[in-house]
């Protein structure tokens, strides 16, 4: 988790002088509780936005937006702590809005936004906005949280972001898999425009089961430049195991931008349909 660029981040708006600061996620008001604390944020919204760095790279960011409740507690609102927790790693990053002037009621509801948390493809986050100071130990909570799922690199807008392009998102192998006679599969896919090797992983499963019954890896050496964008055809021999009929083919490239951690593409071959067993015809006709 990180913030997009390190240029000055602003949270000021008409009627409010505000500065964005790095935070340890442990606000001072936890340790030194205050008697009067503001109410919680209202209408917390998290959306996927895209932002360019100063170098011109494009990254997905969490666009966080919330409003204030229209009660007198805004008189005690000193700022907000924004926290983003990546759920699969438990990594957390926080920033603090520090209000340098007192808030006053005005004709519009106060609204705040922040769009500088860089998020990763295919990851889930918990976004929390805590109003500051935080409540006393038994006080009503004054935060709001929402989970936010970032789409993977198949998503049209994500595909062209820097992290997705680095992991090979622009390569469309257009995999086709054909079942041949004698327990064989023919796998065909389009090579990318880079002299790098690929591996094909064939994993076979019984019908309706998720425990594999066979797995085979096939290595494809780096193509020559004249083979770029051409179709590569590979014939894989299956294990002759009864019922081991559902096959998943994954192709992993080793592009220079992502090395051993490039996006894989896959295709699946289902088990052949079993013909419906016809009703047995009785050899005599009942007479009732």
């Amino acid at each position: 988790l990180r913030l997009l660029d390190h240029r000055a981040l602003v949270c000021s708006q008409p009627g409010l002088n505000c500065t964005v600061k790095n935070s340890t996620c442990l606000d001072d008001s936890w340790i030194h509780p205050r008697n009067l604390t503001p109410s919680s944020p209202k209408d917390l919204q998290i959306q996927l936005h895209f932002a360019h760095t100063q170098q011109g790279d494009l990254f997905p960011v969490a666009h966080i937006e919330w409003t204030l409740q229209t009660d007198a507690s805004i008189l005690y609102l000193e700022g907000a702590e924004l926290s983003v927790l990546q759920l699969n790693t438990n990594e957390r990053l926080c920033v603090r809005f520090e209000f340098l002037s007192k808030l006053r009621h005005h004709h519009r509801r106060w609204r705040f936004t922040f769009s500088h948390f860089v998020v990763d493809p295919d990851q889930e986050y918990e976004v929390t906005v805590h109003h500051l100071p935080k409540p006393i130990p038994d006080g009503d909570p004054n935060h709001q949280s929402k989970n936010f799922l970032v789409p993977d690199c198949e998503h049209a807008r994500m595909k062209v972001t820097t992290p997705c392009m680095s992991s090979g998102s622009l390569w469309d192998p257009n995999i086709t898999v054909e079942t041949l006679e004698a327990h064989q599969l023919r796998v065909s896919f389009t090579l990318w425009n880079e002299s790098t090797h690929y591996q094909i992983l064939l994993t076979s499963f019984p019908h309706m089961e998720n425990h594999s019954c066979f797995e085979h890896m096939h290595h494809i050496p780096a193509p020559r430049p004249e083979e770029f964008h051409q179709r590569s055809n590979v014939t894989l021999t299956l294990r002759n195991l009864k019922g081991c009929c559902r096959h998943q083919v994954q192709i992993q490239p080793f592009f220079s931008s992502c090395l051993n951690d490039c996006l894989r593409h896959s295709a699946t071959v289902s088990c052949p349909e079993m013909p419906d067993t016809p009703e047995p015809i009785p050899d005599y006709m009942p007479l009732w």
Epitope: Q199, T203, E215, H216, M217, R239, D261
Partner: nanobody, 113 residues
Framework: EVQLVKSGGGLVQPGGSLRLSCAAS????????MAWYRQAPGKQREFVAT???????NYADSVKGRFTISRDNTKNTIYLQMNSLKPEDTAVYYC???????WGQGTQVTVSS
């Protein structure tokens, strides 16, 4: 998560032999294809050998006839027996679980007189 524990690297003279092993801590080892890769200084990681769940091996052309990959499902371990070693075999050797894209830490093999 699958942990991979390797052993067996070292310094050997040209023409000599070494055996690498890679033990995987997983209850489904026997249903996983496994592979060895290597990476020489300043070069891209390259494929060495793979073995499927039926025990059938497959080799890079550069090691065919000299290297042998094998597996022992009772010990959750794959092996790479390297004979007739050449200076160009000098590299860090990595054990790989293709299904999960897990990589061992790597073990240095140096072939030099």
């Amino acid at each position: 998560e699958v942990q991979l524990v390797k052993s067996g690297g070292g310094l050997v003279q040209p023409g000599g032999s070494l055996r690498l092993s890679c033990a995987a801590s997983t209850s489904i080892f026997s249903s996983l294809a496994m592979a060895w890769y290597r990476q020489a200084p300043g070069k891209q990681r390259e494929f060495v050998a793979t073995i499927n769940t039926g025990g059938q091996p497959n080799y890079a052309d550069s090691v065919k006839g000299r290297f042998t990959i094998s597996r022992d499902n009772t010990k959750n371990t794959i092996y790479l027996q390297m004979n007739s070693l050449k200076p160009e075999d000098t590299a860090v050797y990595y054990c790989n679980v293709p299904r999960y894209n897990y990589w061992g830490q790597g073990t240095q093999v140096t072939v030099s007189s």
